[in-house]
Structure formats: C-alpha cells, structure tokens
C-alpha cells in the first residue's frame, strides 16, 4: 500500500511539476523591466524565451516574436533547448509511469515489468526537473551578468537593434515558476525511484518456497511473481525479500479493495 | 462616436475643494487608461494624472499629489477628479483625455473651467 | 522628470509652405523593448481642447491630413507641416509619454505670415 501511495504521490507530483515547466516556457514573464528606481512606469517591458513585451499606461500590450533564430543569444537558445527537452522528457516520463501504475491493471503486465518502467519514469523526471533547474538558473545567471551593463539590453544587436539607454531587467515570474517545477518534477522522480524498490524483489535473496492451501497447491517460483494457479484463491501469500517477510495481496486479475488509492 | 462630457463650469472659495466628472461613451469605458490635464488661462497644458477604469489604479504627478483623488463609477461609465484644498493659481480649464496606443491622447472632453478667486 | 523644450515659440509662415517645429526632451523617449519613441504630438486651437496628431513620434492619427509627419529619435524630434494650409493655425504641443509624470513642452505658436 505504502508503495503504491508512494508512487501515485510521485506521479502527482511529477504531473504539477511538468506543468508547472511548460507554463515557465511558455511564459513571457522571464525578466521584467527593474522598476527600482522608478515603481511607476508608463511605459513597462518584459521579456520571454520567445518574445518580448511592451504594455502602457493605455492598457495595451504589444508583443514581438523574436523571429531571428541566428541572431539571438547563445545563452538564450541554450535555455530554450533545456526547457524544450526537459518538457518532452518529462512527457514521455508522464506517458511511461501511467503505464507503471501499480493502481492501474494493463492486461498481464508484471510487476517486474511495472519496476522498470516506474524507474525509467523516475530517472526521466529527475533529468527532466534537472533540465528545468539548469536552463531557468542559466537565464538567471545572464540577468544578473547583464544587469549592470550599460549596453543596450541584454539582447542588444537582435534584429538590428538602435544602441539605447540600458533598460536594465530583473528576474522574472516565470523563473520561479520554473525553479519550482523544476524542483517538484526532481522530487516527484526521487519519489518514483523509491516506489520502484519497493515493487521489484531482489532476485538474489529471492526464496523458492511453495504453499499448500487446501484443494489447491500454490507455489511461487524463482524470478516469477504470479501463483501457478489460475484459480482466485483468497490464500494471502508471503513473498520473501532479504530474509524478512510481507504479506501481499495474491497476484490476480481480479480486482481488490487495496488496487485502487 | 466615442464622447468624453464633463462636467459645467465651476466657481469655488480658497481652501474648498471641487469634483470635475467626465462621463465616456460610444467606447468600453474599462478598457482605456482616462488622463486628466490641467490648462491654466494662456498657459500650456500639464498632466495630473491617471487612473485605469478597470482596477482602480492611479498615477499622480508629484505636484498634485495629496491634494488631488481620481476615482470611477464603472456602472456609469464615468471618471472624476477632486482637487482638494483649492488655491487661486488652481484656476484653470480641466480636460479628461482617453489614453490610446503609443500612451497617446487621442480623445478630449470639452473641458471644465474651475474659477478659484484669490 | 523629462523636461520638454519646444522651439521656436511662436512661427509665422505663408499659406503653402512648409513649417517645421522642433522638440527636445532631457532623456531619451526610445524604448529598447519595442524601439519606439514614446513622444506625441497635439495640435490646439483657441478655445478648444487639444488634438491627437502624432503618437510614438511618426505614426499619423487616423483622419489626420498627411501633409503632418513626424520625425526623429531618442531626444530630438521634429514635427512638419509640408504645405501649410489657413486650419492649421494653432499652438502645437509635444509630450513625453514614456516616463511619469508625462509632461508637455510649452507650445509652438503657428501663425500665417
């Protein structure tokens, strides 16, 4: 039970975190006009992965895609790869650990088989939140190398840009959004690694021991975790693991009041 | 047609204060920042501040500050301005000018003269 | 606060000619964001209230006559009027509509010569 919640929470919590990743990338909110000096401003800019922002005093916003690829910061498209393939990780995690799912019954998929891929998606998320942490801190890193620079902005020479009075830009909403993600996407895989021992014996310690319960014999095999029999015998069977015993629910297609949380 | 009507003519004492209104149709009244511009007789024109219809939110130049209050009534599509604590060089026209792209002023009322006798 | 300086105060010009009237702000009006010049351009005549011509320095009001363009950049900017026709008598004005508090310059006085 305990390895199911364990996983499920780690699924949960990997799911806001990927969400919470994509909303980041797709924010425009990365770093913000610094409005130390001035808290009022009638004219206010911020700037995204993919664009940037101009919103007045008048209420209206105007937004410009940075159309040029060539042209753009190195630093700035290296971001947007690690968020790019830490979203399409973390989706695949996604698609994988629903598979995984000891709550959810797939044909006769085993429980080595749900192991695995509860690993697999783990290790995908914690690269994926890792992914999220690195390109989010690398933006933060050329805000704050380019916040007393009196060059422009920080995307001076995009687009052929005039030379101007620096408009100097903090961090943004988006960047915390991201470092927040990023952070529950890392624990919620840390979480799925954890459910993963928890469902898959230890092959070496594992013991061949057979049962008998009445009319019918029930025995486990080495490597194998389903009851020889294709009977649903209410028979709790005990699987042993470094020498210390649990009792778990007998492996059947039918379900029981512990398949789903 | 966009229109911005204020308010008539007003005569007041020193030290009283006076709410100009200036009620906008023809256009959504919470979807454009209302300006408020001072002109005083054979002078040029100067800005008082601002205020956004749809939150509430204001902007005051430093001058005005603590004497003037820029409030709406969004059910009645109407913006006011009081100016508070009234001094003879207070006379002047006051116009309500809506805010377009560019923070441009694109639509005026007529304008609303406050006499303030020294 | 941007200081607006207008010249000259007043101009007086013939009916055909072209007028040109020149504005300066103590800080620069470009915004780096969207590269545009936050700076307006009204036109008033005598008992009434003021009109939009210009806004973010060159771009032309909707109904406004073409002969009126606007020029320039960062500080230094220039209103035209390439044929002077008799309506266009008035006091002309700019404004800093960047940075709060937005302020106006004094006025250029057009007159017919």
């Known amino acids: 039970m305990a390895v199911t919640a364990c996983q499920g929470l780690g699924f949960v919590v990997s799911l806001i975190g990927i969400a919470g990743i994509i909303a980041a990338t797709c924010m425009d909110q990365w770093s913000t006009q610094d409005l130390y000096n001035n808290p009022v401003t009638a004219v206010f800019n911020y700037q995204g992965l993919w664009r940037s922002c101009v919103r007045e005093s008048s209420g209206f916003t105007e937004c410009r895609g940075y159309f040029t690829l060539l042209g753009l910061p190195a630093m700035l498209q290296a971001v947007r790869a690690l968020m790019i393939v830490g979203i399409v990780l973390g989706a695949i995690g996604l698609l994988v650990s629903i598979f995984a799912l000891k709550c959810i019954r797939i044909g006769s998929m085993e429980d080595s088989a749900k192991a695995n891929m509860t690993l697999t998606s783990g290790i995908m998320f914690i690269v994926s939140g890792l992914c999220a942490i690195a390109g989010v801190s690398v933006f933060a890193n050329m805000l704050v190398t380019n916040f007393w620079m009196s060059t422009a902005n920080m995307y001076t020479g995009m687009g052929g840009m005039v030379q101007t009075v620096q408009t100097r830009y903090t961090f943004g909403a988006a960047l915390f959004v991201g470092w927040v993600a990023g952070g529950l996407t890392l624990i919620g895989g840390v979480m799925m690694c954890i459910a993963c021992r928890g469902l898959a014996p230890e092959e070496t310690n594992y013991k061949a021991v057979s049962y008998h319960a009445s009319g019918h014999s029930v025995a486990y095999k080495p490597g194998g975790f389903k009851a020889s029999t294709g009977f649903g015998s209410n028979t709790k069977n005990k699987k042993i693991y470094d020498g210390g015993a649990r009792t778990e629910d007998e492996v059947q297609s039918y379900p029981s009041k512990h398949d789903y949380v | 047609e966009v229109q911005l009507q204020q308010s008539g003519a007003e005569v007041k004492k020193p030290g009283a204060s006076v709410k100009v209104s200036c009620k906008a149709s023809g256009y959504s009244f919470t979807g454009y920042t209302m300006n408020w511009v001072k002109q005083a007789p054979g002078q040029g024109l100067e800005w008082i501040g601002l205020i956004n219809p749809y939150n509430g939110g204001t902007s005051y130049a430093q001058k005005f500050q603590g004497r003037v209050t820029m409030t709406r009534d969004t059910s009645i599509s109407t913006a006011y301005m009081e100016l508070s604590r009234l001094r003879s060089d207070d006379t002047a026209v006051y116009y309500c000018a809506r805010m377009n792209y560019g923070n441009a002023m694109d639509y005026w009322g007529a304008g609303t003269t406050v006499t303030v006798p020294s | 606060d941007i200081v607006m300086t207008q010249s000259p105060d007043s101009l007086a010009v013939s009916l055909g000619e072209r007028a040109t009237i020149n504005c300066k702000s103590s800080?620069?009006?470009?915004?780096?964001?969207?590269?545009?010049?936050?700076l307006t351009w009204y036109q008033q005549k005598p008992g009434q209230p003021p009109k939009l011509l210009i806004y973010w320095a060159s771009t032309r009001e909707s109904g406004v006559p073409d002969r009126f363009s606007g020029s320039g950049s960062g500080t230094d900017f220039t209103l035209t009027i390439s044929s002077l026709q008799a309506e266009d008598v008035a006091v002309y004005y700019c404004q800093n509509d960047y940075s709060y508090p937005l302020t106006f310059g004094a006025g250029t006085k057009l007159e017919l010569k």
């Open positions: 800080q620069s009006l470009l915004n780096s964001g969207n590269q545009k010049n936050y």
